[in-house]
């Protein structure tokens, strides 16, 4: 990354340009590079108690570059900062620190959480879900015919998945019991979505109308719903509302 590192050479006099190594334009025996060739960045490297000038193609980690008219200079970022825009604004922190608004912190402030991938403090994101979709048709064993009581389902989508500290998503599926006007299955409807059963061809005198799977019927002896009086129907509706159950996968 920092290709040409100009170093001091033996028996160099201060400010002598000849014989400077690498990208140095001028150098001294004691201080290393004093200035750099065009487009290279000048940086001071601490070696023990001494600071040595070096010339680099770009500023090293923990430094930022300023292109002045007469010199390209590397300046140190704050101690906890790995990459910075300038002294005030860090853009990447050193290991163990989290970046928040240009500063490096040990812990993220209240209301924010640490993203351990980017090593930044980010807003806590709560789950967001859509409105419920309409209820599905009333079915029993995958069929919409040949029974009186079944279940219906509705779903909603997750619009925004929560972050680590965000509120979990509420249920996204809801199922409840439902009552339908019992109707016989039409030809070809039988076994739809549900378990298919092989049937003999009807005998000459037999009705061609499909006979519902005995398991699909609540009880053939039950009084059909259309015979219920209005009061019973109302009562049933109230009971069904109370029976409504929610089942779901929590995200």
């Amino acid at each position: 990354q920092n290709a040409s590192r100009g170093r001091r050479q033996r028996r160099m006099h201060p400010n002598v340009s000849q014989g400077c190594q690498g990208g140095c334009a001028t150098c001294s025996d004691y201080n290393g590079c004093l200035s750099c060739k065009p487009r290279l960045f000048f940086a001071l490297e601490r070696i023990g108690m001494k600071q040595i000038g070096v010339c680099l193609s770009s500023c090293p980690s923990g430094y930022y570059g300023t292109r002045y008219p007469d010199i390209n200079k590397c300046t140190k970022c704050k101690a906890d900062c790995d990459t910075c825009f300038n002294k005030n604004f860090c853009t990447k922190c050193k290991s163990g620190f989290y970046l928040h608004l240009g500063k490096c912190l040990d812990n993220c402030p209240e209301g924010l959480e640490a993203n351990n991938h980017t090593m930044e403090c980010v807003s806590i994101v709560h789950c967001e879900v859509s409105e419920w979709n309409p209820w599905s048709p009333c079915t029993k064993k995958g069929k919409t015919c040949g029974f009186k009581r079944g279940t219906e389902t509705r779903v909603r989508e997750i619009i925004q998945h929560p972050s680590a500290k965000g509120n979990l998503c509420p249920p996204t599926n809801e199922t409840r019991k439902c009552t339908v006007q019992r109707k016989k299955c039409q030809k070809g409807e039988r076994g739809k979505k549900g378990r298919e059963r092989k049937r003999k061809k009807p005998n000459k005198g037999e009705s061609k109308e499909a006979i519902p799977d005995s398991k699909s019927l609540e009880s053939s002896k039950e009084i059909p719903e259309q015979r219920e009086n209005k009061q019973q129907q109302k009562k049933r509706k109230v009971q069904d509302k109370q029976k409504s159950v929610s089942v779901s996968t929590v995200h």
């Epitope: 292109r67 002045y68 300038n86 002294k87």
Partner: antibody, heavy 116, light 107 residues
């Protein structure tokens, strides 16, 4: 709290001189390059000059080079702009600002009017 | 010197609108780019640095994007306090240069 307070503005005749000052507080003044940026009435921002943190080098915009000088006194946390041979086109609000690639801190500005 | 071409020079918008201001730079400056906001009679205030990073205290409805020569400032939902003049600046090299400014006015 960072504060930059400019002073020394006023009305001056063309060809005359004026010296602006900027008193800094709330940050380590000697760590920062300091600059002057100006804004003519109803116009945009124009960089005027920057002096580096230790005062050893200064840079100027083309329109003021040779007429303006910039200096600083790190012991007093103060920045100066010496404006000579003033022209009508130097009329502007002059802002003192901490210049570290971006202009991070700004003063409230001081108005300089060059008019006969 | 690096030239900065900011557009539009003025813009009328309503509270709640999404607005975009652009700045074209005459040479590749990577992300060494800054946006400022200036309200009438006040000094400029640094809004975004390194092309996309928000300065402390700047609301999240402001965002910056771009790299190289094309940069954008977006305000997702204008608030009454956002009506001001916006300037871009390249921080890549000396001399520092600014865009001409975009005055954002209430429609």
């Amino acid at each position: 709290e960072v504060q930059l307070v400019e002073s020394g503005g006023g009305v001056v005749q063309p060809g005359r001189s004026l010296r602006l000052s900027c008193a800094a507080s709330g940050f380590t003044f000697s760590d920062y390059d300091m600059a002057w940026v100006r804004q003519a009435p109803g116009k945009g921002l124009e960089w005027v000059a920057t002096i580096i943190y230790d005062g050893s080098r200064a840079y100027f915009g083309d329109s003021v080079r040779g007429r303006f000088t910039v200096s600083r006194d790190n012991s007093k946390n103060t920045l100066y702009l010496q404006m000579n041979s003033l022209r009508a086109e130097d009329t502007a609000v002059y802002y003192c600002t901490a210049h570290d690639r971006s202009f991070d801190y700004w003063g409230q500005g001081t108005m300089v009017t060059v008019s006969s | 010197d690096i030239q900065m071409t900011q557009s539009p020079s003025s813009l009328s918008a309503s509270v709640g609108d999404r607005v975009t201001i652009t700045c074209l730079v005459s040479e590749d400056i990577s992300n060494d780019f800054v946006w400022y906001q200036q309200k009438p009679g006040k000094s400029p205030k640094l809004l975004i640095y390194a092309a996309s990073r928000l300065q402390d205290g700047v609301p999240s409805r402001f965002s910056g994007s771009g790299s190289g020569t094309d940069f954008t400032l977006t305000i997702s939902s204008l608030q009454p306090e956002d009506f001001a003049t916006y300037f871009c600046q390249q921080s890549y090299k000396y001399p520092p240069t600014f865009g001409q400014g975009t005055k954002l006015e209430i429609k």
